[in-house]
Interface confidence: medium
């Protein structure tokens, strides 16, 4: 039993952490393979997660995480029984991959605009609520040249869109990502897109 | 505006239990956390612990692990502290606050002054 | 655990005095991403809530007077008010939430 591409680490920086690999041949993750992980700290627990298959041979583990903090380290071990495949370390402060905003909607908006709001995924509690940015695609559904990316860099998780800044009468898709800057994070998933008519007439006949 | 409704006082005997509450007004309860403090006569603050009303997960002080359990009621926007075994080093005020972050406890309650006596 | 320690443990002043108080962490509490301090300042007044006054170590809450001022990093905060009024008579309390919340003692502020 080997593992082909070693485990890859990112915590969502308030209660879970994921780590992925890949084994040198299909594998039943559950059944065969233990990820043993315990906080770098005298006295900590030491915690197993039993892995899911993703693929026939790539383990996907979660492990839940509590209120990390940045100097938080976790000491990873992969067991196929009593034989250890791989060992190594992981810092979640290190590898932020932000959940993913959430609730996006669209309203109409006074001078021809649209307001796209959407909800911050984290608590005020915790560290990255007050450092997340947001990109948010928007486009045609009906024609793929026809789209348009925003950065939104100032903390409100919203986005005012001029509706002449699209075709009137076409129908647009959104969807927003996060990512957190002083972290170095990766991009979140993209949230679940929404959907609405373009159109140029007063907002009161709608 | 945001305000946390707390009764003003408790008077339980030694040994026994009690459940204090925290009504939430004025912002959507599942949008904060809430958090319990105590506070002795003369003594700083302590932080016991949180609650996050949406999923019910805990937190907690040590301390107070086996001493205080946090709930919620969402339809009834209260959030309760049953404290159990008390003794006279349980009498105290305790406060609820919410908003609790990495800012700062933005909104408090009035405080609970509990008094454990025969 | 992270302890937190206020000093003085009170203190007595006359009206228009500028005061400082100080606060000191067992461990910094700098976020050396964010670059912020996770503190915070609290007033609380006889037989009232306390209210927070400070966070992030400097950054003033919103309806606090400008002479409320909060500095320092790392382990060594500082609360000034630059012109006590009688109002501030209270105990002040810093607060750390780099890793859970801990409170210090506090201090007294007495308006002579």
């Known amino acids: 039993v080997k593992v082909l591409h070693e485990p890859s680490c990112f915590s969502d920086y308030i209660s879970t952490s994921v780590c992925q690999w890949k084994m040198d041949h299909p594998t039943n993750c559950s059944a065969e393979l233990r990820l043993s992980y315990q906080l770098d700290f005298m006295g900590s627990e030491n915690h197993t997660c039993v892995p899911e298959n993703r693929e026939d041979s790539v383990c996907v583990c979660s492990m839940p995480i509590d209120d990390a903090v940045e100097a938080d380290v976790y000491q990873l071990d992969l067991w196929a029984g009593q034989q250890l495949l791989w060992s190594g370390s992981f810092q979640p402060s290190k590898h932020v991959k932000p959940r993913t905003p959430g609730n996006l909607t669209v309203y109409p908006n006074i001078s021809h605009t649209w307001l796209l709001m959407w909800t911050n995924p984290y608590p005020t509690e915790n560290h990255l609520h007050s450092e997340l940015t947001y990109m948010v695609n928007v486009s045609n559904d009906n024609d793929p040249e026809d789209f348009k990316v925003y950065n939104v860099t100032y903390m409100g998780p919203t986005l005012r869109l001029a509706a002449s800044t699209l075709k009137s009468g076409a129908s647009y898709s959104a969807r927003v990502r996060a990512w957190a800057q002083t972290y170095n994070s990766t991009w979140s998933d993209w949230s679940p897109s929404t959907t609405w008519l373009n159109y140029y007439e007063p907002w009161e006949q709608h | 505006q945001v305000q946390l409704q707390q009764p003003g006082a408790e008077l339980v005997k030694p040994g026994a239990s009690v459940k204090l509450s925290c009504k939430a007004s004025g912002y959507t309860f599942t949008n904060y956390w809430i958090h319990w403090m105590k506070q002795r006569p003369g003594r700083g603050l302590e932080w016991i612990g949180r609650?996050?009303?949406?999923?019910?997960?805990?937190k907690y002080n040590e301390k107070f692990k086996s001493k205080a359990t946090l709930t919620v009621d969402k339809p009834s926007i209260t959030a309760y502290m049953q404290l159990s075994s008390l003794t006279s080093e349980d009498s105290a005020v305790y406060y609820c606050?919410?908003?609790?972050?990495?800012?700062?406890?933005?909104?408090w309650g009035q405080g609970t002054l509990v008094t454990v006596s025969a | 655990d992270i302890v937190m320690s206020q000093s003085p443990s009170s203190l007595a002043v006359s009206a228009g005095e500028k005061v400082t108080m100080s606060c000191k962490s067992s461990q910094s509490l700098l976020n050396s991403r964010t670059r912020k301090n996770y503190l915070a300042w609290y007033q609380q007044k006889p037989g009232q809530s306390p209210k927070l006054l400070i966070y992030?170590?400097?950054t003033r809450e919103s309806g606090v007077p400008d002479r409320f001022t909060g500095s320092g990093s790392g382990t060594d905060f500082t609360l000034t008010i630059s012109s006590v009024q009688a109002e501030d008579l209270a105990v002040y309390y810093c607060?750390?939430?780099?890793?859970?919340?801990?409170f210090g003692g506090g201090t007294k502020l007495e308006i002579k």
């Open positions: 607060k750390q939430s780099y890793n859970l919340y801990t």
């Open positions: 992030w170590a400097s």
């Open positions: 609650i996050d009303p949406n999923s019910g997960g805990t």
């Open positions: 606050a919410a908003f609790g972050s990495t800012y700062g406890f933005a909104y």
